[in-house]
């Protein structure tokens, strides 16, 4: 297993609709034909997998149908979008990239992106 550098932004603020997007960039040593991208969430020293997708050359990045993630890939960059976020989902989101093919296998883990989610204030009732 060989190490690989992965870069991602330090901080991202989710939109009022609970959507956060960030770019995950990896330093590929060659042209990879199969890349696996996993988003991990670290909170209170617990790490959980948020979503994962394998990108095969000639195809787009496809997450499972029920995934809260979507993404596109361009060269050595993956543009990730996480939806349906609420204030309780605030945490460090780590991008893990694995170059599955061709051999050798490379693994890179980013430092994480702190995503802040603020639940929108409910609209006050208005009298007309």
């Amino acid at each position: 297993c060989k190490a690989m550098h992965v870069a991602q932004p330090a901080v991202v603020l989710a939109s009022s609709r609970g959507i956060a997007s960030f770019v995950c960039e990896y330093a590929s040593p060659g042209k990879a034909t199969e890349v696996r991208v996993t988003v991990l969430r670290q909170a209170d020293s617990q790490v959980t997998e948020v979503c994962a997708a394998t990108y095969m050359m000639g195809n787009e990045l496809t997450f499972l149908d029920d995934s809260i993630c979507t993404g596109t890939s361009s060269g050595n960059q993956v543009n990730l979008t996480i939806q349906g976020l609420r204030a309780m989902d605030t945490g460090l989101y780590i991008c893990k990239v694995e170059l599955m093919y061709p051999p050798p296998y490379y693994l890179g883990i980013g430092n994480g992106t702190q995503i802040y989610v603020i639940d929108p204030e409910p609209c006050p009732d208005s009298d007309f």
């Epitope: 199969e34 195809n59 051999p103 296998y105």
Partner: antibody
Framework: QMQLVQSGAEVKKPGASVTVSCKAS????????IHWVRQAPGQGLEWVGR????????IFSQKLQGRVSMTRDTSMSTHYLTLSHLRPEDTAVYYC???????????WGQGTLVTVSS | QPVLTQPPSVSGSPGQSVTISCTGT?????????VSWYQQHPGKAPKLMIY???SRPSGVSNRFSGSKSDNTASLTISGLQAEDEADYYC??????????FGTGTKVTVL
């Protein structure tokens, strides 16, 4: 000299499971990806799946997804293919093969015949 | 399961040349230069003969050559010999699965 030596023939009943082993020698075990390919009697080659020894990550043919698993024992330099809920149509010679890079299989085991019959 | 189409059989006399075709689509053979060819004698494991469309592994006779045009790859055996009688399979990367094999071609030396 790179070598892959597979376990002997197996006869199983429908619904049972079978495990085929593939002992590797002559190369650094974790460096080479391993594939499994099967061939039904008188039929062509069918790709079963691939394992990356250094990570344990596997990818399988959609046809067999859910019934197949691939594992490895690094200390024994051995790969294993397990196929569960066997059906008569799983009767085939199962081969392990090393990945030469660029989607080719450069060294092959001698094959293991698995017969599924009631 | 996608499959690459090969002729069921080809034959030739000793010393002649024979060519086996392997037809796919732009999602496999036509889209990438990851075409391989394997030789399989009865009761034996397959042996890699050609990779990356036209490259030969060390130890494989230069009588075996590979090429590709559009969605079709070809394996040519020149100076046909008795020991070339075997089944031949092509394989290719495909964007839906890492590996797909051809239907296989039986080569008979007359």
């Amino acid at each position: 000299q790179m070598q892959l030596v597979q376990s002997g023939a197996e006869v199983k009943k429908p619904g049972a499971s079978v495990t085929v082993s593939c002992k590797a020698s002559g190369y650094t075990f974790t460096n080479s990806y391993i594939h499994w390919v099967r061939q039904a009697p008188g039929q062509g080659l069918e790709w079963v799946g691939r394992l990356i020894p250094s990570s344990g990550y596997t990818i399988f043919s959609q046809k067999l997804q859910g019934r197949v698993s691939m594992t490895r024992d690094t200390s024994m330099s051995t790969h294993y293919l397990t196929l569960s809920h066997l059906r008569p149509e799983d009767t085939a010679v199962y081969y392990c093969a090393t990945d030469g890079g660029n989607y080719n299989l450069d060294f092959w085991g001698q094959g293991t015949l698995v017969t599924v019959s009631s | 399961q996608p499959v690459l189409t090969q002729p069921p059989s080809v034959s030739g006399s000793p010393g002649q040349s024979v060519t086996i075709s392997c037809t796919g689509t732009s999602s496999d053979v036509g889209g990438y230069n990851y075409v391989s060819w394997y030789q399989q004698h009865p009761g034996k494991a397959p042996k890699l003969m050609i990779y990356d469309v036209s490259s030969r592994p060390s130890g494989v006779s230069n009588r075996f050559s590979g090429s590709k045009s559009d969605n079709t790859a070809s394996l040519t055996i020149s100076g046909l010999q008795a020991e070339d009688e075997a089944d031949y399979y092509c394989s290719s990367y495909t964007s839906s699965s890492p590996y797909v094999f051809g239907t296989g071609t039986k080569v008979t030396v007359l």
